[in-house]
């Protein structure tokens, strides 16, 4: 025998209280697949979350973050504060990148400058808090009299920024 509930399309639920009739999902709820015995409560985008896509009878609401924040986690489960380039977020708030590290985005962590010498190259442009170093030709490739910038290597225990 076929389960009568399997005929209930998305946007409805199989109502046990009404002889398993397919009833529309109540307001602020949805069912994204057929054959559901209940509808799921719509996600509400409150506070630092804002609505990117409204809830419908067949799909949940989708949230993103208000300006100054960015999404984290699957389906934007968290909003995290933006920082400026050259900073990273810590418990204390936005903090400048430590010497030898950079962040060219408003989110994420400070990363070390590229170690140019790994590829046998030299530093053409020094790194900053906001930008990675630019590697240039290897010192041997430089013409006589030319020189490259050689900043202190970040391969040490960093101090506080």
């Amino acid at each position: 025998l076929q389960d009568p509930c399997s005929n209930c399309p998305a946007g409805t639920f199989c109502d046990n209280n009404r002889n398993q009739i397919c009833s529309p999902c109540p307001p602020n709820s949805f069912s994204s697949a057929g054959g559901q015995r209940t509808c799921d409560i719509c996600r509400q985008c409150k506070g630092v979350f804002r609505t990117r896509k409204e809830c419908s009878s067949t799909s949940n609401a989708e949230c993103d973050c208000t300006p100054g924040f960015h999404c984290l986690g699957a389906g934007c489960s968290m909003c995290e504060q933006d920082c400026k380039q050259g900073q990273e977020l810590t418990k204390k708030g936005c903090k400048d990148c430590c010497f030898g590290t950079f962040n060219d985005q408003k989110r994420g962590i400070c990363r070390p400058w590229t170690n140019c010498s790994l590829d046998g190259k030299s530093v053409l442009v020094n790194g900053t808090k906001e930008r990675d170093v630019v590697c240039g030709p290897s010192p041997a490739d430089l013409s006589p009299g030319a020189s490259s910038v050689t900043p202190p290597a970040p391969a040490r225990e960093p101090g506080h920024s």
């Epitope: 984290l72 995290e80 810590t90 418990k91 903090k95 430590c98 070390p112 400058w113 391969a155």
Partner: antibody
Framework: EVQLVESGGGLVQPGGSLRLSCAAS????????IYWVRQAPGKGLEWIGN????????FYGEKFMGRATFSADTSKNTAYLQMNSLRAEDTAVYYC??????????????WGQGTLVTVSS | SVELTQPPSVSVSPGQTARITCKLN????????VHWYQQKPGQAPVTMIY?????PDGIPERFSGSSDSSSNSAFLTISGVQAEDEADYYC??????????FGGGTKLTVL
């Protein structure tokens, strides 16, 4: 599923060197710090240093500067720890661990199983 | 530089509550995230609490984290302790945002 699998441990003569591997899978290897931490028998956790595999940038604990070298092969999704001039007190389980990229003072969300290095003649 | 101090051992009877302390030697505990790891013999550490009070998926609700500014300490609390909770527990924070600092570890014994 994120995994860190270590290898390369074993018995090493005093004055010798070791090269440990940390093979990563299940995530974008170039986008997370790999930290190296060791634990001597019956002792606590000790930071050796860390590498950003995306560009080879490294940091070393003061105690290990000049003796430890980190590298990464992005084609193999593997990080390496090379340590020279080993002494008996370097006997420990060596771990690699991944740090998430959310904030600058975050936890280690995945650890390798550890590999035991014994320095003895 | 930042140091974290833990008691070497804590003993508790099954079903009781264990509280492990992690004291920050300088600065304000409210400015530092503290993370907690459990380590059983022969195994790698496992995150029990991260960012002061958050529990990773799969960690029982019996484990909770908190901090107290007056004692400048973070706490790992295990309610309704079970035999399987017997392990070493380490707190973890940062000196700079690159340099991790670990407490010396606390051996939890279930009597």
């Amino acid at each position: 599923e994120v995994q860190l699998v270590e290898s390369g441990g074993g018995l090493v003569q005093p004055g010798g060197s070791l090269r440990l591997s940390c093979a990563a899978s299940g995530y974008t290897f170039t986008s997370y710090y790999i930290y190296w931490v060791r634990q001597a028998p019956g002792k606590g956790l000790e930071w050796i240093g860390n590498i950003w595999p995306g560009n080879g940038g490294t940091f070393y604990g003061e105690k290990f500067m000049g003796r430890a070298t980190f590298s990464a092969d992005t084609s193999k999704n593997t990080a390496y720890l090379q340590m020279n001039s080993l002494r008996a007190e370097d006997t420990a389980v060596y771990y690699c661990a991944r740090r998430p990229d959310y904030s600058g003072d975050d936890y280690f969300d995945y650890w390798g199983q550890g590999t035991l290095v014994t320095v003895s003649s | 530089s930042v140091e974290l101090t833990q008691p070497p051992s804590v003993s508790v009877s099954p079903g009781q509550t264990a509280r492990i302390t992690c004291k920050l030697n300088s600065g304000n505990i409210g400015s530092y995230y503290v993370h907690w790891y459990q380590q059983k013999p022969g195994q790698a550490p496992v995150t029990m609490i991260y960012r002061d009070d958050k529990r990773p998926d799969g960690i029982p609700e019996r484990f909770s984290g908190s901090s107290d500014s007056s004692s400048n300490s973070a706490f790992l609390t295990i309610s309704g302790v079970q035999a399987e909770d017997e392990a070493d527990y380490y707190c973890h924070s940062y000196d700079s945002t690159i340099t991790p600092v670990f407490g010396g570890g606390t051996k939890l014994t279930v009597l």
